[in-house]
């Protein structure tokens, strides 16, 4: 994760900065939300554990035509070591609950903030 680039600044980005930028983007999404996020689209809920970034991307990438989360999708792809495409569920081990994108973003944000506060940047 030491070579994450292209978020807010050019060149290599420290893992702490990359995580902070992802948190900032999720905060902006939740704070700027007026109408239902992504028209109330539903996505698979994920386990916020190991492989979380890829799982989050695999879940969100299936939402199309929602500009509000495009930057988040790009950022998550920087955290996921493999290429993710729509319909791919290799990291989504459990697919039993669907939630609204807005709730997904809130849950992910809470967890990422905890990781950041704990100093877990990788």
């Amino acid at each position: 994760l030491t070579c994450l680039g292209g978020f807010a600044s050019p060149g290599p980005v420290p893992p702490s900065t990359a995580l902070r930028e992802l948190i900032e983007e999720l905060v902006n999404i939740t704070q700027n939300q007026k109408a239902p996020l992504c028209n109330g689209s539903m996505v698979w809920s994920i386990n916020l554990t190991a492989g979380m970034y890829c799982a989050a991307l695999e879940s969100l990438i299936n939402v199309s035509g929602c500009s509000a989360i495009e930057k988040t999708q790009r950022m998550l792809s920087g955290f996921c070591p493999h290429k993710v495409s729509a319909g791919q569920f290799s990291s989504l081990h459990v697919r039993d609950t669907k939630i609204e994108v807005a709730q997904f973003v809130k849950d992910l944000l809470l967890h990422l903030k905890k990781l950041f506060r704990e100093g877990q940047f990788n």
């Epitope: 807010a8 600044s9 702490s16 900065t17 902070r20 948190i23 900032e24 905060v27 704070q31 903030k113 905890k114 950041f116 506060r117 704990e118 100093g119």
Partner: antibody, heavy 123, light 107 residues
């Protein structure tokens, strides 16, 4: 009204352990996004951040002092305690506690401070 | 650790003057820069957080600006009650670090 007050010994001998207590009011450390920091300022020097504890007991320390520091909280008493082992004359400073709130972005901005307590390390 | 260099260390200005204090970080702190005020015998007060956001109750004559490594605190019209020491603090990376302070006096 948010207030914080530091208490502890005025004088500590070298090699002893310093225990400082921050007693606060006007907020609860059981509330999400709340945290308390300890900061110190030696005479004629800049402020130095020591440690932080969040509402959910996540603790962070200044790496330069981590081996000597322990931070803990007693939510029911509205207190945060900092212990610092193996005190040395260079640890002579005014010690402050302050509140941090992390709503939205994690700013690490201390919005309310205590008055500070001066600790002298001398034999 | 990120080093915070604050200038000047002291200044003397007249009531009504525009006063600027600078803070330079040893690396990009991405706007996570806070400013504090300590008046003699009083508790430290947060003035500005995240470069330019005014803390509640802070007079509008205080403002902050900057980006990257360079940040500025401005008092648009110095008042007698602004006599204090001001210091900056970066909140981007732990350990949190502070500038050395700027003592502001009235001429």
């Amino acid at each position: 009204e948010v207030t914080l007050k530091e208490s502890g010994p005025v004088l500590v001998k070298p090699t002893e352990t310093l225990t400082l207590t921050c007693t606060f009011s006007g907020f609860s450390l059981s509330t999400s996004d709340m945290g308390v920091d300890w900061i110190r300022q030696p005479p004629g020097k800049a402020l130095e951040w020591l440690a932080h504890i969040w509402w959910d007991d996540v603790k962070r320390y200044n790496p330069a002092l981590k081996s000597r520091l322990t931070i803990s909280k007693d939510t029911s008493k509205s207190q945060v305690v900092l212990t610092m082992t193996n005190m040395d004359p260079v640890d002579t400073a005014t010690y402050y506690c302050a509140r941090t709130v992390s709503s939205g972005y994690i700013y690490y901005a201390m919005d309310y401070w205590g008055q500070g307590t001066t600790v002298t390390v001398s034999s | 650790d990120i080093q915070m260099t604050q200038t000047p260390s002291s200044l003397s200005a007249s009531v009504g003057d525009r006063v600027t204090i600078s803070c330079r970080a040893s690396q990009d702190i991405r706007n996570y820069l806070n400013w504090y005020q300590r008046k003699p015998g009083k508790v430290v007060k947060l003035l500005i957080f995240y470069t330019s956001k005014l803390h509640s109750g802070v007079p509008s004559r205080f403002s902050g600006s900057g980006s990257g490594t360079d940040y500025t605190l401005t008092i648009s019209s110095l008042q007698p009650e602004d006599v204090a020491t001001y210091f900056c603090q970066q909140g981007n990376t732990l350990p949190l670090t502070f500038g050395g302070g700027t003592k502001v006096e009235i001429k």
